[in-house]
Amino acid sequence: IVLRPSRVHNSEENTMRALTLKDILNGTFSYKTFFPNWISGQEYLHQSADNNIVLYNIETGQSYTILSNRTMKSVNASNYGLSPDRQFVYLESDYSKLWRYSYTATYYIYDLSNGEFVRGNELPRPIQYLCWSPVGSKLAYVYQNNIYLKQRPGDPPFQITFNGRENKIFNGIPDWVYEEEMLATKYALWWSPNGKFLAYAEFNDTDIPVIAYSYYGDEQYPRTINIPYPKAGAKNPVVRIFIIDTTYPAYVGPQEVPVPAMIASSDYYFSWLTWVTDERVCLQWLKRVQNVSVLSICDFREDWQTWDCPKTQEHIEESRTGWAGGFFVSTPVFSYDAISYYKIFSDKDGYKHIHYIKDTVENAIQITSGKWEAINIFRVTQDSLFYSSNEFEEYPGRRNIYRISIGSYPPSKKCVTCHLRKERCQYYTASFSDYAKYYALVCYGPGIPISTLHDGRTDQEIKILEENKELENALKNIQLPKEEIKKLEVDEITLWYKMILPPQFDRSKKYPLLIQVYGGPCSQSVRSVFAVNWISYLASKEGMVIALVDGRGTAFQGDKLLYAVYRKLGVYEVEDQITAVRKFIEMGFIDEKRIAIWGWSYGGYVSSLALASGTGLFKCGIAVAPVSSWEYYASVYTERFMGLPTKDDNLEHYKNSTVMARAEYFRNVDYLLIHGTADDNVHFQNSAQIAKALVNAQVDFQAMWYSDQNHGLSGLSTNHLYTHMTHFLKQCFSLSD
């Protein structure tokens, strides 16, 4: 018998406590990460605890305050941005959220050399987007859907576009659907590397149908929010890309970049823009039927002052088994020759890997390979390529950072993170300084997150940037649930799952089971990350077992699993959750009379369909802001996976995959339906239609709406939501309050 000190002695057990719902709602056990704001190869900015903006020099070990908290406070700044010449800082205040990424703000420019705010030719307010040029201190900004340029912060602005109009023409910023489903940014303008040119997108939403919903506010009459929002099969935005010379903007004005002929022949999207040099740019386009993507490299023609995109510099990426790319089509990372690039796409075995393209995609050289996936290319230098993958120990829910030496032949691969803090850290991201001289590693778990600084040449750890000591201490007297990540093999499908078990879990006892599901295409729920959240509380205090399962359609395990749901959303995702539940029951510790499922957004759709599957497995379930019919959701997202809702395409499955079609099947389950009335993303319409179908079928159900709340149900609504859902589940599982 080996005696070892136990963490839980009787005396200690008394001081240990379970998590409370209050802990979760107050964010008591939230963690911090440290992402340096790199400004050179060896310097970064960071906002100190007392809100000073501090510049750190790694090599000298020195630091000094570049901007005082007094200055930040004088304008109530919540964000800042240093100009590359270090002469100015913009200060952002009056933040006003719009959609997921977009917001408006007031901007003030502080002159660091003179120690005062810039006066004269002040910026208008509110501004939709503002950024410095990559060199010097030119400013580009978007105001009232038009783009403006300043050569220096105190100079008068030069207006680049004039046709901007609310909800009609968007210049330099995306419309709703491009922001949410294509660009995943608040901006649609891009400076060339040395600031000579500015590229921007123009989105024309004139013909797009409008979603309108009431915002109740406090006034006598609600106001109506109108958003041009193309639902599946509807008219889409028309996009054009322009480039302007910022040195002499009035000389020839904006020049349009031509769209590749094979793309322009039918409806299409612009998916991303990558500058290669000041006079070479790379644009990516996508057919509306999103299985063909074209990468087009364009060159500036000095003589004509135009941009030329030769057919020889067009690279086609096509998927025959699904859609192009993963969630998005990957973007290229160019090498120093300014023509060849590295890009992640599917190899012949159907795994997403890094390829090197020198001339044609057909002649691409595969850089990584195996039954795992390369996930992100962080940086390419003269001699190294840094990327992340889930290769290590064959756990798809991990992320480690690798370095491939591309300067030597044959290239050698090294895992930078695999053995650093093996138990604590299995899920990393990284942030690199210029030329990858230094980098920060941010570990998200499974242990308490930690951020560290490393030498880019030797990979040596230089210092800990943030180790969450306070959190570690706070958790010392908390009975956290146990977590395990394992896999089920079912009919040649691998189902990875995460199980969250009560602190005193005993396999011989029976526990209520809650399935938390998202399940959307190219998503991943089973990840080796740290979290103290609502489900942690349910396990810790309420004694539930919670399980998350990655079924067909989820990411980073190869195309077979990913593309299995192509054109068939709402089928296999649900089947795989049900299969997993049956396997969990077989494990012997689940009380099969007390099984619930819940999900949000796509997860709300899956949980609704699972409850209405007629299996009798689920006693109850919750759908928060669910999609109920793919005809109600955004074109860009929906059509990627479902095709078009037309008779000659996929209308039949659009109709078959609705929640409403299964209204009768909710009769024998307890269903809680929740939605925000001001959801710009998954419109309240979705839940309204579920409710209508349930009423028409005379099926009893519970519902909660959140007035004027969007898809995130934030603020006080969050507290109300989780309290309400907790009561619902405890009632369902016959747990005393």
């Epitope: 510049l55 004088s74 050399s113 120690g115 005062e116 006066r119």
Partner: antibody
Framework: QVQLVQSGAEVKKPGASVKVSCKTS????????IHWVRQAPGQRLEWIGG????????NYNQKFKGRVTITVDTSASTAYMELSSLRSEDTAVYYC?????????????????WGQGTLVTVSS | DIVMTQSPDSLAVSLGERATINCKSS????????????LAWYQQKPGQPPKLLIF???TRESGVPDRFSGSGFGTDFTLTISSLQAEDVAVYYC?????????FGQGTKVEIK
């Protein structure tokens, strides 16, 4: 009493460079920017540039850009102004002056204390 | 750049009399956020550096006699010496510190008549 003490008079040949120092005392050096202003015989005062001692970032009048370099040595509470490629028109009295840093967006200060001046004569 | 123009170039006033110097800027020196005028007045005696008299167009620097006053807003400003004293003989400069480059007027020489 606040003091800004400048280095002595200089005589330089055309094409040469001159470096003038400005040693400050009796105030917190990092609370003020240092500016350089010159006055050619019978001419108006002309701003050359300034520097923030907190970060060492200079700001130059475009007219002098490429010819002037302003630096600080915070440990010695001293500012320097170097003017290169001197020509006869650069003959002037060169002053340093301090200006309080404006932390608030509604602030902004004039140059409240000046050095005694340094006569730079450019002659062949 | 903001151009500062003073008038007159020189001024001869009897002791005890009022002296008025005007200064015009090529653009407004009012900052919309605080409605202040970013204009200063300096006095320079022979062989000496300039001395700050007035800032914000009308606020006297501490230690400056109250016979010196500043007024005006936007683009037109005035320095007034209500009762000229012998020690007030000097060249007076206006200066804008609204934006860079900082610029000065050409100066007004005040003498005793």
């Amino acid at each position: 009493q606040v003091q800004l003490v400048q280095s002595g008079a200089e005589v330089k040949k055309p094409g040469a460079s001159v470096k003038v120092s400005c040693k400050t005392s009796r105030y917190t050096f990092t609370e003020y920017t240092i500016h350089w202003v010159r006055q050619a015989p019978g001419q108006r005062l002309e701003w050359i540039g300034g520097i923030n001692p907190n970060n060492g970032i200079p700001n130059y009048n475009q007219k002098f850009k490429g010819r002037v370099t302003i630096t600080v040595d915070t440990s010695a509470s001293t500012a320097y102004m170097e003017l290169s490629s001197l020509r006869s028109e650069d003959t002037a009295v060169y002053y340093c002056a301090r200006r309080r840093i404006a932390y608030g967006y509604d602030e902004g200060h004039a140059m409240d204390y000046w050095g005694q001046g340094t006569l730079v004569t450019v002659s062949s | 750049d903001i151009v500062m123009t003073q008038s007159p170039d020189s001024l001869a006033v009897s002791l005890g009399e009022r002296a008025t110097i005007n200064c015009k800027s090529s653009q407004s020196l009012i900052y919309s956020r605080n409605q202040k005028n970013y204009l200063a007045w300096y006095q320079q005696k022979p062989g000496q550096p300039p001395k700050l008299l007035i800032f914000w167009a009308s606020t006297r620097e501490s230690g400056v006699p109250d016979r010196f006053s500043g007024s005006g807003f936007g683009t037109d400003f005035t320095l007034t010496i209500s009762s000229l004293q012998a020690e007030d003989v000097a060249v007076y400069y206006c200066q804008q510190y609204f934006s860079y480059p900082l610029t000065f007027g050409q100066g007004t020489k005040v003498e005793i008549k």
